[in-house]
Interface confidence: medium
């Protein structure tokens, strides 16, 4: 969590002098309660906005907007604390709006906004706006909270943001997985325009279970420039296990911008429909002579049509 702080943060508006300050998320009014405190924010809204940095990078930001209630408590409103909590890490970042002049009633409802919290693709946040000073112990709460889920990099608008592009969002491998005879899967995917290696992670499962019955990782060497955007074909000859027929194929790139943390794409192959009569096992011999390893496939050939479910 961080602030997009390339320009001075502004909270002033006509009729109000205001400054934005970093906050420890522990306002002084917690420690020294005041007798008179303002009411809570009204109509808290959080939206996904996009902001450019001076360097030209584009980041997703949380646009936080709220209004004040039309009651006399605004006379005691000294500011607001904005808190963003990333739910999966418990990381919290706060800023404080400090009012330098007293609010007056005017015809229009007071409205505030802030769009400088940079958020991460696919993450969920809890956004809280606390009016200051905070309430006395056992006093009515004067904050409002809302959860905010940031779309992941598959989202069209997110895909072109700097964090998504850095993790390989523009690469669409268009994975296809085809079940062949003789316990084979043919995986095909489109290479990106970077000379970097890939890993194919294969996990197989029995028809109705979530215990894996086979796992392996395959290294695909970095393509040459003339292979960029070409299809790479990988044949995986699997362990022959009756029922070990549901395969998840995941492709992990190692682009220079994201290294070990690039977006993975995956496809799954469902178990084939059971035929009424068992298929005969074909006599099968590879066209080439194996050089190393050891051989063993258990049970009948699993034959199935091509399945292709592609996601990040």
């Amino acid at each position: 969590l961080r602030l997009l702080d390339h320009r001075a943060l502004v909270c002033s508006q006509p009729g109000l002098n205001c400054t934005v300050k970093n906050s420890t998320c522990l306002d002084d009014s917690w420690i020294h309660p005041r007798n008179l405190t303002p009411s809570s924010p009204k109509d808290l809204q959080i939206q996904l906005h996009f902001a450019h940095t001076q360097q030209g990078d584009l980041f997703p930001v949380a646009h936080i907007e709220w209004t004040l209630q039309t009651d006399a408590s605004i006379l005691y409103l000294e500011g607001a604390e904005l808190s963003v909590l990333q739910l999966n890490t418990n990381e919290r970042l706060c800023v404080k709006f400090q009012f330098l002049s007293m609010l007056q009633h005017h015809r229009k409802r007071w409205r505030f906004s802030f769009s400088h919290f940079v958020v991460d693709p696919g993450q969920e946040y809890e956004v809280t706006v606390h009016h200051l000073p905070k309430p006395i112990p056992d006093g009515d709460p004067n904050h409002q909270s809302k959860n905010f889920l940031v779309p992941d990099c598959e989202h069209a608008r997110m895909k072109v943001t700097t964090p998504c592009m850095s993790s390989g969002s523009l690469w669409d491998p268009n994975i296809t997985v085809e079940t062949l005879e003789a316990h084979q899967l043919r995986v095909s995917f489109t290479l990106w325009n970077e000379s970097t290696h890939y890993q194919i992670l294969l996990t197989s499962f029995p028809h109705m279970e979530n215990h894996s019955c086979f796992e392996h990782m395959h290294h695909i060497p970095a393509p040459r420039p003339e292979e960029f955007h070409q299809r790479s074909n990988v044949t995986l000859t699997l362990r022959n296990l009756k029922g070990c027929c549901r395969h998840q194929v995941q492709i992990q790139p190692f682009f220079s911008s994201c290294l070990n943390d690039c977006l993975r794409h995956s496809a799954t192959v469902s178990c084939p429909e059971m035929p009424d009569t068992p298929e005969p096992i074909p006599d099968y011999m590879p066209l080439w002579e194996p050089r190393s390893g050891s051989s063993d496939y258990k049970d009948d050939d699993d034959k199935g049509s091509s399945h292709h479910h592609h996601h990040h």
Partner: antibody, heavy 131, light 107 residues
């Protein structure tokens, strides 16, 4: 160098449960299948069953109703339980590893072949079923 | 179950002889077959995997061939340490099954 060592009681009474453990040393139990095989004078070598490190099992249908194979990855061990034993279950019991990977690279396309077979065996433990 | 048969069940040979053992499967098993050597009181030791590939560390006088239903283990020049029992193992389908064995002894 991966080594396997079977352990368990050498004598089991009829109708009781035979329990054996295979300890894997010199390598990880992960990403392999692990087998139990037995050899009795009357029946030759007989495959009992196997287990993947994740817990997924396959059993010989002739023994399936009496066999349980389990794995403890934290101890690098897998175990065999054979219930309701009779004198016909007297045998030398072996544990064995199953699973190797070979890669073949072509131009622009890649072949990954899994060749299996029991390549590493324990030395075997004799179990006698007798009252 | 796939039934594996071996022939001969035993044979007597001399050092330096060429020895051939055959294994047949009751149905096609591609090349999913291994050959094992066992000496008395010892565990089986794999010689050949994938029907024809030599296990690392095994002398080159051992070779395997075949595919589908018929397989052969050949010892090109029998050595004193080769007197043992030889088994084939199919690992094409559950349950894995072994051949009954071929005992090779000194003539």
């Amino acid at each position: 160098q991966v080594q396997l060592q079977e352990s368990g009681p050498g004598l089991v009474k009829p109708s009781e449960t035979l329990s054996l453990t295979c300890t894997v040393s010199g390598g990880s139990i992960s990403n392999y299948y692990w087998n139990w095989i037995r050899q009795s004078p009357g029946k030759g070598l007989e495959w009992i069953g196997d287990i993947y490190y994740s817990g997924s099992t396959n059993y010989n249908p002739s023994l399936k109703s009496r066999v349980t194979i389990s794995v403890d990855t934290s101890k690098n061990q897998f175990s065999l339980k054979l219930s309701s034993v009779t004198t016909a279950d007297t045998a030398v019991y072996y544990c064995a590893r199953d699973g190797e990977l070979a890669n073949y690279y072509g131009s622009g396309s890649y072949q990954f072949y899994y060749y299996y077979g029991m390549d590493v065996w324990g030395q075997g433990t004799t179990v006698t079923v007798s009252s | 179950d796939i039934l594996m048969t071996q022939s001969p069940s035993s044979l007597s040979a001399s050092v330096g002889d060429r020895v051939t053992i055959t294994c047949r499967a009751s149905q096609g098993i591609r090349n999913d077959l291994g050959w094992y050597q066992q000496k008395p009181g010892k565990a089986p030791k794999r010689l050949i995997y994938a029907a024809s590939s030599l296990q690392s560390g095994v002398p080159s006088r051992f070779s395997g061939s075949g595919s589908g239903t018929e397989f052969t283990l050949t010892i090109s020049s029998l050595q004193p340490e080769d007197f043992a029992t030889y088994y084939c193992l199919q690992h094409n389908s559950n349950p894995f099954t072994f051949g009954p064995g071929t005992k090779v002894d000194i003539k």
